[in-house]
Interface confidence: low
């Protein structure tokens, strides 16, 4: 009888990660008696993948009906392929020996290449908030893809960004790769609703790229503008002073009224109105009883926004311009800060 040959008909096999790889192998004879083993790699460091004789190979199934008496098909399926499974697989026939089986003949090998999808891109921004006109950096990371070729793009609100640097690691051959990119974005006052998008395109995604996003609302701080105005009220001896706090983000804001440098009232922004661009407006007012003051009053609206140093705006209230009313000892009343009650 002709000497046994081990035939591996496929020089290479390309499989997507998570799928099953079929590695084909047939023998031309049943003689000599002995098991087939599959190895990844050659030489002394080769890795046993399947042993027909014994062992536990939970990911491997045999292709042919294993109960056939004259089975010469030793093809296997390896389930749930990962990039770590890439390599050259050899089907090796052993002949039965004592005490150990003896390697008899090897197939030519089948190179298994694994196509692995990149993980969903994760975009992260700076740890601290920044104000408009500042440049901030965003990073995008995606891992576990193969082959190495990959395209990464950055967008801000649909507009492609050009100021970024990208690295794919490792540089040499590997079972899988990672991509890391850093983009620079200049903030504007209108960026509360803006998004930065990292888009990754890879052969495994069949033209449907993966996207990771970061909301600039988590990055931006828009400081408020303050305006203090005086409005007369019906009672001759009272003046309504308002502090308009405009175009701020985020909402965290504390306002303090000072009369001649002394704290009159402190309140926290609650009933705010939202602008179209995502920033907030708020108004606070102080009802000043002019008759309680002999001299002019310096009223200061002091705002601490999002833990930043306080900003303030002052207004000089001319007492001489108002008639005095005897017997009143109330300098100011807290009439609340809901602007719908003002007019």
């Amino acid at each position: 009888e002709e000497e046994l040959q081990v035939i591996q008909p496929d020089k290479s096999v390309l499989v997507a990660a998570g799928e099953t790889a079929t590695l084909r192998c047939t023998a031309t004879s049943l003689i000599p008696v002995g098991p087939i083993q599959w190895f990844r790699g050659a030489g002394p460091g080769r890795e046993l993948i399947y042993n027909q004789k014994e062992g536990h190979f939970p990911r491997v199934t045999t292709v042919s009906e294993s109960t056939k008496r004259k089975n010469m098909d030793f093809s296997i399926r390896i389930g749930n392929i990962t990039p770590a499974d890439a390599g050259t697989y050899y089907c090796v026939k052993f002949r039965k020996g004592s005490p150990d089986d003896v390697e008899f003949k090897s197939g030519a090998g089948t190179e298994l290449s694994v196509r692995a999808k990149p993980s969903a891109p994760v975009v992260s921004g700076p740890a601290a908030r920044a104000t408009p006109q500042h440049t901030v950096s965003f990073t995008c990371e995606s891992h576990g893809f193969s082959p190495r070729d990959i395209t990464l793009k950055w967008f801000k609100n649909g507009n492609e960004l050009s100021d970024f640097q990208t690295n794919v690691d490792p540089v040499g051959e590997s079972v899988s790769y990672s991509i890391h990119s850093t983009a620079k974005v200049v903030l504007t006052r209108e960026d509360v609703h803006s998004q930065v998008i990292c888009e990754v395109a890879h052969v495994t995604l069949q033209g449907d790229p993966l996207r990771g996003t970061a909301n600039l609302s988590e990055t931006i701080r828009v400081p408020p503008t303050l305006e203090v105005t005086q409005q007369p009220v019906r009672a001759e001896n009272q003046v309504n002073v308002t502090c308009q706090v405009r175009k701020f983000y985020p909402q965290r804001l504390q306002l303090t009224w000072l009369e001649n440098g002394n704290v009159s009232r402190t309140e926290t922004a609650s009933t705010v109105t939202e602008n179209k661009d995502g920033t907030y407006n708020w108004m606070s007012w102080l009802l000043v009883n002019v008759s309680a003051h002999r001299d002019d009053v310096k009223l200061t609206c002091q705002v601490e926004h999002d833990g930043q140093p306080a900003v303030s705006k002052s207004h000089d209230l001319k007492v001489s311009a108002h008639p005095k009313e005897q017997g009143s000892n109330t300098a100011a009343e807290n009439t609340g800060s809901n602007e719908r009650n003002i007019y």
Partner: antibody, heavy 120, light 107 residues
Framework: QVQLVQSGAEVKKPGASVKVSCKAS????????ISWVRQAPGQGLEWMGW????????NYAQKLQGRVTMTTDTSTSTAYMELRSLRSDDTAVYYC?????????????WGRGTLVTVSS | DIQMTQSPSSVSASVGDRVTITCRAS??????LAWYQQKPGKAPKLLIY???NLQSGVPSRFSGSGSGTDFTLTISSLQPEDFATYYC?????????FGGGTKVEIK
Amino acid sequence: QVQLVQSGAEVKKPGASVKVSCKASGYTFHGYGISWVRQAPGQGLEWMGWISAYSGETNYAQKLQGRVTMTTDTSTSTAYMELRSLRSDDTAVYYCAREAGSSWYDFDLWGRGTLVTVSS
Amino acid sequence: DIQMTQSPSSVSASVGDRVTITCRASQGISSWLAWYQQKPGKAPKLLIYAASNLQSGVPSRFSGSGSGTDFTLTISSLQPEDFATYYCQQGASFPITFGGGTKVEIK
């Protein structure tokens, strides 16, 4: 026909030994491992141990270590399970089962079982 | 040892019902779980191997799912011949262990 044929029922006294056989046919006996599984009356399945039909390598359940011996005879495609120092709680149906090719420790082929009764 | 906990221990159902049996491993076993059906006086029969693969000749109304520690056997439409006891079994490592069984009875 692919099958595992087991020996007949046994009645034993406490302290005695029993040897149950399991003859394989219809497939290459040495290509698979054999496990032994027992089932006490009205109870669930309990794995006793495994033997490679090719190499004779064994792995036994801890609680039976020292009392059980599993062997194979490739010339007759037969697996054997011997249990010594029998106790009343060894009364059970004893099954031999072949590991499937799909995953080494799944059992796709079972014998019909051998009832071993231990009673004084 | 890896403990296998099956629930419920019994379930009453009618022909046509959808029946779900769960099995939990005390530690991760990847997909190396099998499901068996056993009828009184008979040997167990392999239904599902590697958690979700249907054994040859088993009706497609049987399906398995899960990986790691939590697994499910589903009978989509119970047939008269399906009234039996079902066992899960981990094949990840020695010692091999079985669940306590779930008896599917006629309501």
